[in-house]
């Protein structure tokens, strides 16, 4: 009778993750009697994924019924695949000896490959806030996919950038990998609402990519321009100064009036307004008492905005140009939240 | 139904041969290695010989040059051949199938005594 | 040869009673152990191969363990219907030998 021979038929599977793999093996013999055992890798430091014989196997079942004596086939199936499971696998015939089973035959080997799908890409940007004109730099990062080739893009509105540099790791042989991307973006002051978008593509997921956002508006600082501005007269010795801050970005801002280099009053942004490219403005005012200064006073609006170095915008008060009303030093009346009288 | 039958015992006189028979059915024969095993009245288990697949054979030392085994595929049939008999061979002799991957003896046949007596 | 030791040779027990009876081997039979059970007047049946490996239609109340040379066949509650004389059988090397047997008698 011909020597039994270890046929493993299919040179290599591959299996997602996640899924079941079929490992074939075939005896073309029922003689030498002895265990079937399969292993993951050669030499020495082989893993052993199922013993016929002996041992608790959970992710292991057989194709066929083992026990039976005239079963020639020793396929198995591994459940619940993982990137870890790859590998070359090898079904090895034993004879039955004494004190230990011997090796007799083994099958070519089947290699398995595994499909897995990259985790969900995570776009981070920079620590701190950057002002329009600006470049920063975006990290994707996506993990755990296989095999190693992969597609990653950026995009900006929907519009493709081009100046980013991508590594996939490991470079060797690996059960899975790992991408990481950094993308450098130009700020402009309309950039309030854009989205930095990272896409993706991976075998596994069958055209449709996954994406990773970040939202600009976490990222940029638009400074406010101010202007300051001297409305009509109200009475006769009441001038209303105004502060309008306009395009900033994010609300936080602080508004501090000074008089003639003196702090008058200091308050927080509140009731703003916004405008369509997601920026904000917002006015302060004072009610000006000219008949309580004798010579021309200096306004001062003067703005910190998300904690950065105050900028400020001055107006000079013509005192000589208004007649004076003897007397008239007491406070005029404060009819908004917004007024203060200068004495 | 998996079954394995026995038949030719009987009383021989010592120095005399017989011939074991073993009737097997629903399984392929052809593909188990099959034993025999005997049991002497009140004694405990011996077992006898086996053929494997290829036809390759063994004995224990009680038994070698003595008893011969064979098998008729065709016929799904095991045989046991024995000569010179003696007194220390009175038993009934049991056919077993060799029916697991290890060849543990998975199906036994009713057995057949054999009386070897003057 | 390969000796194998039976023991006890003979158990009183009770129904429901968990029982244990071990073998040894002269030697290393590479787990290649089978216990077999017999009846007065019947053909043994296989229980366990592979030292631990439950036959096909074999209650799971039957339990086979140990490695080497020591082995040991564990019933954990007894019927009317197992007592019976238990045999081991080493299977690893010509000329596969038995034990001499225990008899598992009700008490």
């Known amino acids: 009778e011909e020597e039994l021979q270890v046929i493993q038929p299919d040179k290599s599977v591959l299996v997602a993750a996640g899924e079941t793999a079929t490992l074939r093996c075939t005896a073309t013999s029922l003689i030498p009697v002895g265990p079937i055992q399969w292993f993951r890798g050669a030499g020495p430091g082989r893993e052993l994924i199922y013993n016929q014989k002996e041992g608790h196997f959970p992710r292991v079942t057989t194709v066929s019924d083992l026990t039976k004596r005239n079963n020639m086939d020793f396929s198995i199936r591994i459940g619940n695949i993982t990137p870890a499971d790859a590998g070359t696998y090898y079904c090895v015939k034993f004879r039955k000896g004494s004190p230990d089973d011997v090796e007799f035959k083994s099958g070519a080997g089947t290699e398995l490959s595994v499909r897995a799908k990259p985790s969900a890409p995570v776009v981070s940007g920079p620590a701190a806030r950057a002002t329009p004109q600006h470049t920063v730099s975006f990290t994707c990062e996506s993990h755990g996919f296989s095999p190693r080739d992969i597609t990653l893009k950026w995009f900006k509105n929907g519009n493709e950038l081009s100046d980013f540099q991508t590594n996939v790791d490991p470079v060797g042989e690996s059960v899975s990998y790992s991408i990481h991307s950094t993308a450098k973006v130009v700020l402009t002051r309309e950039d309030v609402h854009s989205q930095v978008i990272c896409e993706v593509a991976h075998v596994t997921l069958q055209g449709d990519p996954l994406r990773g956002t970040a939202n600009l508006s976490e990222t940029i600082r638009v400074p406010p321009t101010l202007e300051v501005t001297q409305q009509p007269v109200r009475a006769e010795n009441q001038v209303n100064v105004t502060c309008q801050v306009r395009k900033f970005y994010p609300q936080r801002l602080q508004l501090t009036w000074l008089e003639n280099g003196n702090v008058s009053r200091t308050e927080t942004a509140s009731t703003v307004t916004e405008n369509k490219d997601g920026t904000y403005n917002w006015m302060s005012w004072l009610l000006v008492n000219v008949s309580a200064h004798r010579d021309d006073v200096k306004l001062t609006c003067q703005v910190e905005h998300d904690g950065q170095p105050a900028v400020s915008k001055s107006h000079d008060l013509k005192v000589s140009a208004h007649p004076k009303e003897q007397g008239s030093n007491t406070a005029a009346e404060n009819t908004g939240s917004n007024e203060r009288n200068i004495y | 139904e998996v079954q394995l039958v026995e038949s030719g015992g009987g009383l021989v006189q010592p120095g005399g041969s017989l011939r074991l028979s073993c009737a097997a059915s629903?399984?392929?024969?052809?593909?188990?290695?099959m034993h025999w095993v005997r049991q002497a009245t009140g004694k405990g288990l011996e077992w006898v010989s086996v053929?494997?697949?290829?036809?390759?054979?063994y004995y224990p030392g009680s038994v070698k040059g003595r008893f011969t085994i064979s098998r008729e595929n065709a016929k799904n049939s095991l045989y046991l051949q024995m000569n010179s008999l003696r007194a220390g061979d009175t038993a009934v002799y049991y056919c077993?199938?060799?029916?697991?991957?290890?060849?543990?003896?998975?199906?036994w046949g009713q057995g057949t005594m054999v009386t070897v007596s003057s | 040869d390969i000796q194998m030791t039976q023991s006890p040779s003979s158990l009183s027990a009770s129904v429901g009673d968990r029982v244990t009876i071990t073998c040894r081997a002269s030697?290393?039979?590479?787990?290649?152990l089978a216990w077999f059970q017999q009846k007065p007047g019947k053909a043994p049946k296989s229980q366990i191969y592979?030292?631990?490996s439950l036959q096909s239609g074999v209650p799971s109340k039957f339990s086979g363990s140990g490695s080497g040379t020591d082995f040991t066949l564990t019933i954990s509650s007894l019927q009317p219907e197992d007592f019976a004389t238990y045999y081991c059988?080493?299977?690893?090397?010509?000329?596969?030998?038995f034990g001499q047997g225990t008899k598992l008698e009700i008490k």
């Open positions: 059988q080493q299977y690893n090397t010509y000329p596969y030998t």
């Open positions: 629903g399984f392929t024969f052809s593909s188990y290695d």
């Open positions: 077993a199938r060799g029916g697991n991957w290890d060849d543990a003896f998975d199906i």
């Open positions: 053929i494997g697949i290829s036809g390759d054979t």
């Open positions: 592979t030292a631990s």
């Open positions: 030697q290393d039979i590479n787990n290649y």
